[in-house]
Interface confidence: medium
């Protein structure tokens, strides 16, 4: 099925050009999306092209600038946030990235009523996190690992926590491992719906081993970066959840929320917090052995000023075939009765579906079902539930938005997006206004992305928010590669693949093949999305065929495929890439002497193992920032899939699944190993150990390090990286430069 045909006709051929590497590195063909910043049922804010902050009212059709670009520029603001009472705006500047989500910044508060910045009791700098209360204009912020509260922007701050200490105690913000592997946010504090209470997490990293690496900088001596980072089997952070009454913070003080007994009996994690009402909160906990999750609903007890979490309000989710949840345990979406909720978890057939839980998980009512998966619940209103799934036409790499009417019986289901722009749009996400009065649809492809605004009652399209016209025009004279998404059936396993073919692809000719792999648990590479990237260039200009294959361990096709890799990382993911390559060779247009594989991060691990598989299939390959041993990676992620590296658990497979153990097998392939020296995530240690093992085995290989670069290899390093990898592949495939 050809999803994105090239617009090449013979008469036009002389005016068309192939993609260049420069196009990719310059981001010439990048697209825009439009996500409204909703502030009510019918109003949203958007930053205009000239940097004014504009308020749009859908119903009146009016728009006006609430904050001028002049005001933004006066403090070099790169971001903003309007207080819910619309009296103040915070302006964010001096952005300084820390880890994946976290950053520090300077914040200024602008008073919209008098058009001036708030003077007196200004915020300290730099701040680690800042947010408005959901009602009014209270502020909560984290500074030097402690939480502060302001009733009004001009007030002095009220200090809630005092024990915050760099790399030791984190209040209201996650430590490294919780940020990257559990919360996936820069914050760990949550306002109750009306701002009465503020819940926050305290992470104690005192006993966690520290990863230390050099940051070379420009000084005479490098400095050492120290991060408490629990690797597999190491001591983990100790988490506690507190809730403070923001009306009387000094007199009542923070109250700790109790941990369910069945969780507290051994090492555990806190996984998420969801406010239900101002006086009801839902916490999710997870055993360190991540196959048991407990959802605990807690109520405020006025008489004792404490939070009570009765056993009758504990809901257990357990997996007997793998780990709990998908990548993360799903979060509940509560209904209007403030006790029942909707949640995605595996049904009896092993597919993730929406369930409605009223009293117990055992009595859950299944809302969706089929040999496909519900992926996200966007919004529950009085009469509708909006969700996304990959049901339509049985393509796992698509995303469509559905509406289930929950007000009527039996509930009826409608696909909102399936037939809107069927060829162009098969992968959607959505953003809803209050009470789902309106929503925005953002289509990511396979055609050029488009964002549209819709009526929440009728689903009618109101207007196009962004259609990427400039991009469409720019691509008119570009020879884009063809893309097809198909599947292979091998030994009762379905292997979906995406193939990117040169513009003048001729099935009777032979082409070099590059496999791009990620392959991590609960990932998906074969998606119906638009992209003009490095592999597009390799197909368009260099005439390569590129393939992406979703093998065992990947997501959204049921638990059998997902949990196949449980406790066995590095086996089936590699096997399935190899199997797919063999099938591609059988198709007749692959030059089997010119096959390469490359991947980044988990993909670097898989590509390394594939190269060292001893099959003789691959001529060469690249591993960027690979994991080389699961003993070197983060506890939360690794143990989810591998258990513990102890003799009585899974130490044997930890040892068997390293790249180093297969050093000898690299002798007959060309291997390019790449890593950033300041990688906080997959430590440089991983590549250092691969290199050491290869040297000890007297195996020749190529390597590139990027000084002071992290896991993303950003900035100028990106250009250098892709240029370097391009040369390596062209040399491997004997393509002229």
């Amino acid at each position: 099925i050809v999803l994105r045909p090239s617009r090449v006709h013979n008469s036009e051929e002389n005016t068309m050009r192939a993609l260049t590497l420069k196009d990719i590195l310059n981001g010439t063909f990048s697209y825009k999306t439009f996500f409204p910043n909703w502030i009510s049922g019918q109003e949203y804010l958007h930053q205009s092209a000239d940097n004014n902050i504009v308020l749009y009212n859908i119903e009146t059709g009016q728009s006006y600038t609430i904050l001028s670009n002049r005001t933004m520029k006066s403090v070099n603001a790169s971001n903003y946030g309007l207080s819910p009472d619309r009296q103040f705006v915070y302006l964010e500047s001096d952005y300084s990235k820390l880890w994946r989500y976290s950053y520090t910044a300077t914040y200024y508060i602008y008073d919209l009523s008098n058009g001036e910045f708030v003077r007196g009791n200004e915020l300290p700098r730099p701040i680690q996190y800042l947010c408005w209360s959901p009602v009014g204009s209270k502020l909560a912020y984290v500074y030097q690992n402690n939480i502060y509260l302001k009733q009004r922007p001009g007030d002095p701050p009220f200090q809630i926590t005092f024990n915050g200490r760099e790399n030791k105690i984190f209040n209201g913000i996650p430590d490294w491992v919780y940020e990257e592997e559990m919360l996936a946010t820069k914050y760990a504090l949550w306002w109750s719906p009306n701002g009465k209470f503020l819940a926050y997490a305290e992470f104690n990293d005192t006993d966690i081993p520290v990863i230390a690496y050099s940051y070379y900088g420009d000084e005479q001596y490098p400095r050492t970066i120290n991060i408490p980072y629990p690797k597999a089997g190491a001591k983990n952070p100790v988490v506690r959840i507190f809730i403070i009454d923001t009306t009387y913070p000094a007199y009542v003080g923070p109250q700790e929320v109790p941990v369910p007994a069945m969780i507290a009996s051994s090492d555990y994690y806190f996984s998420w917090l969801t406010w239900v009402t101002d006086e009801r909160v839902c916490l999710q906990w997870l055993k360190r052995v991540q196959n048991v999750s407990v959802l605990s609903i807690c109520d405020f007890r006025e008489d004792w000023q404490t939070w009570d979490c009765p056993k009758t309000q504990e809901h257990i989710e357990e997996s007997r075939t793998g780990w709990a949840g998908g990548f993360f345990v799903s979060t509940p979406v509560f209904s209007y009765d403030a006790i029942s909720y909707y949640k995605i978890f595996s049904d009896k057939d092993g597919y993730k579906h929406i369930h409605y839980i009223k009293d117990t998980v055992e009595n859950a009512i299944q809302i969706t079902s089929g040999k496909w998966e519900a992926i996200n619940i966007f919004r529950v209103t009085q009469d509708s539930l909006f969700y996304s799934s990959n049901e339509f036409e049985e393509y796992p790499g698509r995303r469509n938005i559905y509406r289930i009417s929950i007000g009527s019986y039996p509930p009826s289901k409608k696909c909102v997006t399936c037939h809107l722009r069927k060829e162009r749009c098969q992968y959607y996400t959505a953003s809803f206004s209050d009470y789902a009065k309106y929503y925005a649809l953002v289509c990511y492809g396979p055609g050029i992305p488009i964002s549209t605004l819709h009526d929440g009652r009728t689903d009618q399209e109101i207007k196009i928010l962004e259609e990427n016209k400039e991009l469409e025009n720019a691509l008119k004279n570009i020879q884009l590669p063809k893309e097809e998404i198909k599947k292979l059936e091998v030994d009762e396993i379905t292997l979906w693949y995406k193939m990117i073919l040169p513009p003048q692809f001729d099935r009777s000719k032979k082409y070099p093949l590059l496999i791009q792999v990620y392959g991590g648990p609960c990932s998906q590479s074969v998606r119906s999305v638009f992209a003009v990237n490095w592999i597009s260039y390799l197909a368009s200009k260099e005439g390569m065929v590129i393939a992406l294959v979703d093998g065992r361990g990947t997501a959204f096709q049921g638990d059998k495929l997902l949990y196949a890799v449980y406790r066995k990382l590095g086996v089936y993911e590699v096997e399935d890439q190899i199997t797919a390559v063999r099938k591609f060779i059988e198709m007749g247009f692959i030059d089997e002497k010119r096959i390469a594989i490359w991947g980044w991060s988990y993909g670097g691990y898989v590509s390394s193992l594939a190269l060292a598989s001893g099959t003789g299939l691959f001529k060469c390959g690249i591993a960027v920032a690979p994991v080389s041993s699961w003993e070197y990676y983060a506890s939360v992620y690794t143990e989810r899939f591998m258990g513990l590296p102890t003799k009585d658990d899974n130490l044997e497979h930890y040892k068997n699944s390293t790249v180093m153990a297969r050093a000898e097998y690299f002798r007959n392939v060309d291997y390019l190993l790449i890593h950033g020296t300041a990688d906080d995530n997959v430590h440089f240690q991983n590549s250092a150990q691969i290199a050491k093992a290869l040297v000890n085995a007297q195996v020749d290989f190529q390597a590139m390090w990027y000084s002071d670069q992290n896991h993303g290899l950003s900035g100028l390093s990106t250009n250098h990286l892709y240029t370097h990898m391009t040369h390596f592949l062209k040399q491997c495939f004997s393509l002229s430069d």
């Epitope: 009791n121 502060y148 009733q151 007030d155 002095p156 701050p157 009220f158 200090q159 005092f162 009454d245 009306t247 009387y248 913070p249 000094a250 007199y251 009542v252 003080g253 006025e302 000023q305």
Partner: antibody, heavy 119, light 107 residues
Amino acid sequence: QVQLLESGGGVVQPGRSLRLSCAASGFTFSSYAMHWVRQAPGKGLEWVAFISHDGNRNSYADSVRGRFTISRDNSKNTLYLQMNSLRAEDTAVYYCARDLGYYNGFSYWGQGTLVTVSA
Amino acid sequence: DIVMTQSPSSVSASVGDRVTITCRASQGISSWLAWYQQKPGKAPKLLIYAASSLQSGVPSRFSGSGSGTDFTLTISSLQPEDFATYYCQQANSFPPTFGPGTKVDIK
């Protein structure tokens, strides 16, 4: 204007009980948290107890916790302090004070009522 | 509990003098400090809250400053009615605690 008037003080034997009252006027009593603060003869000020505007939250100093109970009747604009198991060290002038609001200071004070605990 | 200390414990001054009283907290309290004036036989009266904000009705000769652990109350020009005992109070963490007081008397 804001007025706070304490009553109920007097001489009491150790181990006995006493109930103090504070009548409020000149402001919307139900909107403010209230406190009791005491001052032993010739000594400094010591905070005793707090109650939220709606009566749902209260807090006590360690020295009185379990013996004293703060309460209020918003319909009567009155604050109370029930003092049980009184000790000699509880001898002091007891002031009721209106909370400053979010700032947790004491914006207005009553004139005080003397409690003497003596055998 | 946060311990508050004041210095000096007493000060003798004349009308028109500038008087400065300092207050120190045993741990950081941000700006959550109040100052009170108490005359013999009377109830305390709030002068300054949030370290530097003047309570309404209080003469502008009274001012407060400081944050963290060190705070100051300044009377720019002492008046006859200002002879009294002054207390600081922290309001940042439970329980609220007072300093021991500073007595300002006539020289």
